[in-house]
Interface confidence: medium
């Protein structure tokens, strides 16, 4: 019951986390204009991974995509890649974990298979969460080191225009969404890995063995004695090795030619 709960909770937490990673990746507010240090408070600039926007107090809003790939900073490309990898891994992880859920019956899938799938999805969630956290952290570092706006000529899709005024940007809402979402995905992945341990069937290191006593063939099995009488007497009272011990699956209810000499 605890295993099912842990697995289910891990799945839900990861699902919320991945939804958050997707939301953060799509959001425009990765970096926002620091209005406190800017004398022009009527205009609010904010930038995302895919486009840059401006909003005015008059209500005018405009967003423009980054038209070029070659002109964009390599760091921005790296952040995009990390976030996309995180989403893809997370999505695959979700797909795998749906089939791995203990509460869902799919054909005659064994617990060992579900355990393996749970572990796989857990690892995928962990990597997905780490990718998101890494991506957001790289972008945050870009802002801290003023790298983002020092490459204000990133608008090279328009012919390399450079802004005449350097605007200082601060952390946007998307960064916090990304950090939290990445953390949730990571936690969900850890929970799935923990659940995997409980799902895996504990393998016994022994097999049930039949022992044939002299005179009477008695099969001893774990969990109670089960005797079966042999036919005829063993006059020589000699047991050959071949018929001495057999696994439970091999126990026969009739004597074979090897049982008695």
């Amino acid at each position: 019951m605890a295993v099912t709960a842990c697995q289910g909770l891990g799945f839900v937490v990861s699902l919320i986390g991945i939804a958050g990673i997707i939301a953060a990746t799509c959001m425009d507010q990765w970096s926002t204009q620091d209005l406190y240090n800017n004398p022009v408070t009527a205009v609010f600039n904010y930038q995302g991974l895919w486009r840059s926007c401006v909003r005015e107090s008059s209500g005018f809003t405009e967003c423009r995509g980054y038209f070029t790939l070659l002109g964009l900073p390599a760091m921005l490309q790296a952040v995009r890649a990390l976030m996309i990898v995180g989403i893809v891994l997370g999505a695959i992880g979700l797909l795998v974990s749906i089939f791995a859920l203990k509460c869902i019956r799919i054909g005659s899938m064994e617990d060992s298979a579900k355990a393996n799938m749970t572990l796989t999805s857990g690892i995928m969630f962990i990597v997905s969460g780490l990718c998101a956290i890494a991506g957001v952290s790289v972008f945050a570092n870009m802002l801290v080191t003023n790298f983002w706006m020092s490459t204000a000529n990133m608008y090279t899709g328009m012919g390399g225009m450079v802004q005449t005024v350097q605007t200082r940007y601060t952390f946007g809402a998307a960064l916090f969404v990304g950090w939290v979402a990445g953390g949730l995905t990571l936690i969900g992945g850890v929970m799935m890995c923990i659940a995997c341990r409980g799902l895996a069937p504990e393998e016994t290191n022994y097999k049930a063995v039949s022992y044939h006593a002299s005179g009477h063939s008695v099969a001893y099995k774990p969990g109670g004695f089960k005797a079966s009488t042999g036919f005829g007497s063993n006059t020589k009272n000699k047991k050959i090795y071949d018929g001495g011990a057999r696994t439970e699956d091999e126990v026969q209810s009739y004597p074979s030619k090897h049982d008695y000499v």
């Epitope: 005015e56 423009r64 012919g159």
Partner: nanobody
Framework: EVQLVESGGGLVQPGGSLRLSCAAS????????VGWFRQAPGKGLEFVAA????????NYADSVKGRFTISRDNAKNTLYLQMNSLRAEDTAVYYC???????????????WGQGTLVTVSS
């Protein structure tokens, strides 16, 4: 070399009309948002109007709304400002600017013209 050249300025009576033009060269005009700013004698730079790169959206200062109309012709690399019902307070040097956004914030514009003088007087 990028050049923005304004024309169409001059002397006009109050209530009259004037059409300013801004010819762009040395840049992919259709990729830029362009706008008009003005500077009255002894005053600071003031936003007038701007139009997005596609021409799909416009932005006007409250003082000119309903009187001025901004438009662009990407095929001719030209920006226009149709000014109607002109007032004495509209007297200023009008500058054409090219930038990323059609915003009222002058800092968003990277390219500027030399300006054309518009005088509204009786």
């Amino acid at each position: 070399e990028v050049q923005l050249v304004e024309s169409g300025g001059g002397l006009v009576q109050p209530g009259g009309s004037l059409r300013l033009s801004c010819a762009a060269s040395g840049l992919i005009f259709s990729n830029y948002a362009v706008g008009w700013f003005r500077q009255a004698p002894g005053k600071g730079l003031e936003f007038v109007a701007a139009i997005t790169w596609s021409g799909g959206s416009t932005n006007y200062a409250d003082s000119v709304k309903g009187r001025f109309t901004i438009s662009r012709d990407n095929a001719k690399n030209t920006l226009y400002l149709q000014m109607n019902s002109l007032r004495a307070e509209d007297t200023a040097v009008y500058y054409c600017a090219g930038g990323f956004f059609a915003t009222s914030y002058s800092g968003n514009y990277g390219y500027w013209g030399q300006g054309t003088l518009v005088t509204v007087s009786s």
